[in-house]
Interface confidence: low
Amino acid sequence: HKCDITLQEIIKTLNSLTEQKTLCTELTVTDIFAASKNTTEKETFCRAATVLRQFYSHHEKDTRCLGATAQQFHRHKQLIRFLKRLDRNLWGLAGLNSCPVKEANQSTLENFLERLKTIMREKYSKCSS
């Protein structure tokens, strides 16, 4: 079957997100991928969206992330905009209302996004072949 247009949009957004670091991509988020053996794909997407929503809700106005220079400010605002887009698309792909995120493990946002990108690319390669 053909790949969902949402999946293509997610990969495109993840590519943009992982291209440049900001002051806050080194901050930690819940690592939902650490122990996801008994988790369905939809649950994984839902939980990833939840983690991203928690991150941007908490750090959108964080002055440590906004930085002191105009360039740092632009980059953080762009990061938040991309995270919101990613959150919205992941919810669409998951089709679930809510999902628990209880893991204790942490990972940097940067690593979290790289891992998510790998998963999405794998999914894309399967659905496009």
Epitope: K61, Q71, H74, K77, Q78
Partner: nanobody, 116 residues
């Protein structure tokens, strides 16, 4: 053609106040986030404050938080920056800017000098 015209700068004593205005034209003002950026003599650009399209949220750099207030009047296509409790380190050229990724249009700037 997009135009941003700042006004309201000048010389003020420490602890004093100023209100900067930015008259915008050439684009649909209410559809864009707007901000203030400043450049102190011999230094790089520093973002000061930001207000999104709807104006419900406002953002401030730590250095001005609690002293500066950004606002906008979409009916007048005008952006404002109320600056209170001014300090010598606030001395800079203040620029009004449109959009944030990156700021794609700038005004000519207005000079604010804080000195006794």
């Amino acid at each position: 053609e997009v135009q941003l015209l700042e006004s309201g700068g000048g010389l003020v004593q420490p602890g004093g106040s100023l209100r900067l205005s930015c008259a915008a034209s050439g684009f649909t003002f209410e559809e864009y986030g707007m901000g203030w950026v400043r450049q102190a003599p011999g230094k790089g650009l520093e973002w000061v404050s930001w207000i999104p399209e709807g104006g419900r949220r406002t953002y401030y750099a730590d250095s001005v938080k609690g002293r500066f207030t950004i606002s906008r009047d979409n009916s007048k296509n005008t952006l404002y920056l109320q600056m209170n409790s001014l300090r010598a380190e606030d001395t800079a050229v203040y620029y009004c800017a449109k959009n944030y990724s990156p700021f794609d249009y700038w005004g000519q700037g207005t000079l604010v000098t804080v000195s006794s």
